[in-house]
Interface confidence: low
């Protein structure tokens, strides 16, 4: 079951899925000046069996010199600083990291893909939030959101996170020094 809307927005924070539940779709978007190849996949799909999951289908972009494209913006893969770069056009995924059963890792880039990745999450998906550079986290609770099904409708739980500028000194009583990111994840792993 696909989640109806996007995870909630938190001021000065970005979210990131550390793994993607089977059924998650990623649109095959191309940078400006490029378009999907004819007969190419519209999306990549996280699929698998009980023991392994991986990205099915493949995204491929081709030059659209002969045709204008709309709403397709992006730098080359190596310019995409805000995303982990496990790169490959066909849907291979890193395999030396511990895998969550029924989940896929971050899909690898493809040549000339768009900057912004458009995911279609499924019920049960969890995303983690962290403050953008220049802001620090004041935690009231979990800095994560889960897509849940309630009374036949999907909704995202509200992450309990406030991001405050480094110049501000306000801190909740008894709060420990906040960590940069959940479970010590690299600061570079940010928005989806």
């Amino acid at each position: 079951e696909l989640c109806d809307d996007d995870p909630p927005e938190i001021p000065h924070a970005t979210f990131k899925a550390m793994a993607y539940k089977e059924g998650t779709m990623l649109n095959c978007e191309c940078k400006r000046g490029f378009r999907r190849i004819k007969s190419g996949s519209l999306y990549m799909l996280c699929t698998g069996n009980s023991s392994h999951s991986s990205w099915d289908n493949q995204c491929q972009c081709t030059s659209s010199a002969t045709r204008n494209t709309t709403k397709q913006v992006t730098p080359q893969p190596e310019e995409q600083k805000e995303r982990k770069t496990t790169e490959m056009q066909s849907p291979m995924q890193p395999v030396d990291q511990a895998s969550l059963p029924g989940h896929c890792r971050e899909p690898p880039p493809w040549e000339n893909e768009a900057t912004e990745r458009i995911y279609h999450f499924v019920v049960g998906q969890m995303v983690y939030y962290q403050c953008v550079q220049g802001y620090r986290a004041l935690h009231r609770g979990p800095a994560e959101s889960v897509c849940k099904m309630t009374h036949g409708k999907t909704r995202w739980t509200q992450p309990q996170l406030i991001c405050t500028g480094e110049m501000e000194t306000s801190q909740f009583p008894g709060e420990e020094k906040p960590q940069a990111s959940p479970e010590g994840r690299p600061e570079s792993e940010t928005s989806c």
């Epitope: 099915d56 190596e78 490959m88 291979m92 690898p108 040549e111």
Partner: antibody
Framework: QVRLQQSGPELVKPGASVQMSCKAS????????INWVKQRPGQGLEWIAW????????YFNENFKDKATLSVDKFSSTAFMLLSSLTSEDSAVYFC???????????????WGTGTTVTVSS | QIVLSQSPAILSASPGEKVTMTCRAS?????IHWYQQKPGSSPKPWIY???NLASGVPGRFSGSGSGTSYSLTVSRVEAEDAATYYC???????FGGGTELELK
């Protein structure tokens, strides 16, 4: 020691099919993609397809979609490629190769099989 | 589909000489890999992600390039370097036609 041992040479008639194998050892078979590569006599390398042994997902070079069928046997850590409707154009050495990636995430073929020679002749 | 063109097809060199072979892509790519193959043997990974030497590759080899032009250079050719070298696009697995390095 990581190894990919391929099956022996095949002499087949035009129109027939042939299946070759690639037995992996020295690593966890289900954790790495297996690729197949064709090399005609005196020619260059041509990528055919890959299979992920963990779940059987495959991806093909368009030129080989109707020619090759990939499968795996997880229990014997063996990958298979079936070539059908053979013609003289299919006479070649076929390699299996394991894909790995460097820290930048750039995938490459780090271990290659010994190669299987297929000769199509009447 | 990315097309990789290698030149020259055959490169003749004397021992100790410096040689460079080129791999050109039909459109801009992020990285390419190089493989070495000797007659009757399987290809071996030689240089990955444009400039990283694979395990066991002598330091006289180097790789460079960006965009549509990449090269493999041997600073001082030795007899054991005689082989065919193939470039490969990291992202679609397309191979170039190969450059055969032969010793005079």
């Amino acid at each position: 020691q990581v190894r990919l041992q391929q099956s022996g040479p095949e002499l087949v008639k035009p129109g027939a099919s042939v299946q070759m194998s690639c037995k992996a050892s020295g690593y966890t078979f289900t954790d790495y993609y297996i690729n197949w590569v064709k090399q005609r006599p005196g020619q260059g390398l041509e990528w055919i397809a890959w299979i992920f042994p963990g779940n059987g997902n495959t991806y093909f070079n368009e030129n080989f979609k109707d020619k090759a069928t990939l499968s795996v046997d997880k229990f014997s850590s063996t990958a298979f490629m079936l070539l059908s409707s053979l013609t003289s154009e299919d006479s070649a050495v076929y390699f299996c190769a394991r894909a790995t990636y460097d820290h930048g995430g750039y995938w490459y073929f780090d271990v290659w099989g010994t190669g299987t020679t297929v000769t199509v002749s009447s | 589909q990315i097309v990789l063109s290698q030149s020259p097809a055959i490169l003749s060199a004397s021992p100790g000489e410096k040689v460079t072979m080129t791999c050109r892509a039909s459109s801009s790519v992020s990285h390419i890999h190089w493989y070495q193959q000797k007659p009757g043997s399987s290809p071996k990974p030689w240089i990955y992600a444009t400039s990283n030497l694979a395990s066991g590759v002598p330091g006289r080899f180097s790789g460079s390039g960006s965009g549509t032009s990449y090269s493999l250079t041997v600073s001082r050719v030795e007899a054991e370097d005689a082989a065919t070298y193939y470039c490969q696009h990291w992202n679609s697995f397309t191979f170039g036609g190969g450059t055969e390095l032969e010793l005079k």
